[in-house]
């Protein structure tokens, strides 16, 4: 295309510009620590800086951390990217009762519904689960397993949640967490892709290089690049994303280069203090007991209510262990094991007693 | 074991250049990055910038933004830090650090550092 | 940029006492800080990351708490390797930024 010549030859006088032969144009240069926005940029509005890894770009144009979801009861919703936070919400099993800021402050198990009712509506990360009245045809023996599960007590939940005791109230702590999901965690992350980095059990071997093309010394292609579990801010400041480290916690959205991690509670509980991508304080989710009925929500993040079933409705289970499973959890975890491979280093907080389980490994008190 | 080994004290004029190296060992050079903070006499730590060794990327303090330079060379997995026009109150001790690989997060706190090297500027 | 305030900025103290260094951040940063030791002539070196978490091989007399804006650095039994410097930092949002530091001195 020799009416392209001249035009390279153009942008070789212009210092600020480039030739791209891929797409045949004048393209402007990015200046140093910025990158372009696309592949060919135009002008500087088409370059952004760029965060670390964890971080984001915020609206003030600074690199701020992406929030963590590393919360055993949260989860990852979507990645810390390079504009904006990581954002979490409640694990599968349970729905947020208060929102945080890209997260779930409380997370509860969704409700079992209790005999004589069966599930209308199941719960989903938002809502809770909603009962209705079985009909009058379904046997005794129950229409589906999941409306058999009671509380393996058979006492009455608590109107009110108990708080779960976290060695810490924070909810952008790092405390280490329990040596399975851990391991899960590590083992999902070493797959992800470059823009999303891995925050936990990464291997370190992706400083958190940016997503799109490599940019070699004075190219002028760097995007603004942040460390690892940092994201770029909407304001292009590289800014710690909050850590879900906590065992009540979980990562519900991964820190991202241009969002933060997102943390919620872990299933079975549900956020009683909210914070920013995060919550503050996990508590135990209560369970539907028998002869109680979930009142349906208008709110997504209301706690459960309960009120009696309709008159001449039966439970149409009793709860046994023949009929009926146990939740997995219906108490707070009072301590946090510490597992041996949680890092290269056990780091303790130092607020928290610790103490040596039957299996040798420490327990950090969370009382 | 990670060490950062930094190069010798710098007389400079005002209005001159200087360039600090740092040379890293005992892991992937290319795996972390590496990051500059000074300390004038007597004073705070101020963080001054970091490079992507891996990319060549790199991001400054607004405040030294201009007049500073960070390279590596991964060949010989050596860290530079150049600031030019020199003046009087940019005489501090200057240090490379690089962020632990520590805990379940990669936060930039700062467990490995240089011996540190000292810049004078006078007339 | 976050600045950190750090008191006092002296501090007397004798072996054995307790002591206690606060930080107090411009704004938010969560639990992002850390504490740094530094001896003249060296380079500071971590004692807790993440607002209270104790870093390897520091002793256990040295403990950290507080989160959003307010930090603090607690000595519980002053011994005489620990008359220094103190710095926080806060690695929440870049730039970077230290505390002015605080020097423990022999009373």
């Known amino acids: 295309f020799p009416q392209d010549r001249p035009f390279e030859d153009t942008c070789h006088g212009n210092p600020s510009h480039y030739y791209d032969k891929a797409v045949r144009r004048c393209c402007y240069r990015c200046p140093m620590g910025l990158f372009p926005t696309q592949q060919c940029p135009q002008r500087p509005t088409d370059c952004r800086k760029q965060c670390e890894p964890d971080y984001y770009l915020d609206e003030a144009d600074r690199c701020t951390a992406c929030v963590t979801c590393s919360r055993d009861d949260l989860v990852e919703k979507t990645p810390c990217a390079w504009n904006s936070s990581r954002v979490c919400e409640c694990r599968p099993g349970m729905f947020c009762s208060t929102s945080a800021v890209n997260s779930c402050a409380r997370c509860f198990f969704h409700s079992v519904c209790p005999a004589g009712m069966i599930v209308k509506f199941p719960g989903t990360a938002q809502k809770n689960t909603v009962c209705e009245p079985a009909s009058p045809g379904v046997s005794p023996a129950c229409a589906s397993p999941e409306n058999c599960k009671e509380p393996s007590s058979g006492t009455i939940p608590q109107a009110k949640p108990t708080p779960v005791s976290p060695a810490t109230s924070s909810a952008s702590t790092m405390p280490v967490r329990g040596g399975t999901r851990l391991a899960q965690e590590a083992a999902s992350k070493l797959t992800r892709a470059p823009d999303s980095p891995s925050s936990v059990g990464r291997p370190s071997s992706d400083p958190g290089l940016s997503p799109t093309q490599p940019c070699p010394e004075g190219s002028g292609d760097c995007r603004k690049q942040c460390e690892p579990d940092y994201y770029l801010d909407e304001a292009g400041r590289c800014t710690a994303c909050v850590s879900c480290s906590r065992d009540d916690l979980v990562e519900k959205t991964p820190c991202a280069w241009n969002s933060s991690r997102t943390c919620e509670c872990r299933p079975g509980m549900i956020c009683a203090t909210s914070a920013t991508n995060s919550c503050a304080r996990c508590v135990p989710y209560p369970i539907c007991a028998a002869e109680t009925v979930t009142k349906p929500q208008d709110m997504a993040e209301k706690d459960t209510t309960f009120e009696a079933p309709p008159l001449g409705t039966q439970p149409d289970c009793n709860p046994t262990p023949e009929n009926g499973e146990a939740p997995a959890s219906t108490s707070p975890t009072q301590s946090l094991l510490v597992d041996s491979q949680a890092s290269k280093t056990l780091p303790i907080p130092t607020s928290a007693p610790v103490a040596l389980s039957s299996t040798g490994k420490p327990v950090l008190d969370a009382g | 074991q990670v060490q950062l080994v930094q190069s010798g004290s710098e007389l400079k004029k005002p209005g001159a250049s200087v360039k600090v190296s740092c040379k890293a060992s005992?892991?992937?050079?290319?795996?972390?990055?590496i990051h500059w903070v000074r300390q004038p006499p007597g004073k705070g730590l101020e963080w001054i910038g970091y490079?992507?060794?891996?990319?060549?990327?790199?991001d400054y303090n607004q405040n030294f933004q201009g007049r500073v330079t960070i390279t590596a060379d991964k060949s010989t997995s050596t860290a530079y830090m150049e600031l030019s026009s020199l003046r009087s109150e940019d005489t501090a001790v200057y240090y490379c650090?690089?962020?632990?690989?520590?805990?379940?997060?990669?936060?930039?706190?700062?467990?490995?550092w240089g011996q540190g090297t000292t810049v004078t500027v006078s007339s | 940029d976050i600045q950190l305030t750090q008191s006092p900025s002296f501090l007397s103290a004798s072996v054995g006492d307790r002591v206690t260094v606060t930080c107090k951040a411009s704004?938010?940063?969560?639990?992002?800080v850390a504490w740094f030791q530094q001896k003249p002539g060296k380079a500071p070196k971590v004692l807790i990351y993440?607002?209270?978490y104790r870093y390897s091989g520091v002793p256990d007399r040295f403990s950290g708490s507080g989160s959003g804006t307010d930090f603090t650095l607690t000595i519980s039994s002053l011994q005489p390797e620990d008359f220094a410097e103190y710095f926080c930092?806060?690695?929440?949002?870049?730039?970077?930024?230290f505390g002015g530091g605080t020097k423990v001195e022999i009373k």
């Open positions: 704004q938010n940063v969560g639990t992002n």
């Open positions: 993440s607002a209270s």
């Open positions: 005992g892991y992937t050079f290319t795996t972390y990055t």
């Open positions: 930092q806060q690695y929440h949002t870049y730039p970077l930024t």
């Open positions: 490079i992507n060794p891996s990319s060549g990327c790199s």
């Open positions: 650090a690089r962020r632990a690989d520590y805990g379940n997060y990669e936060y930039t706190w700062f467990a490995y």
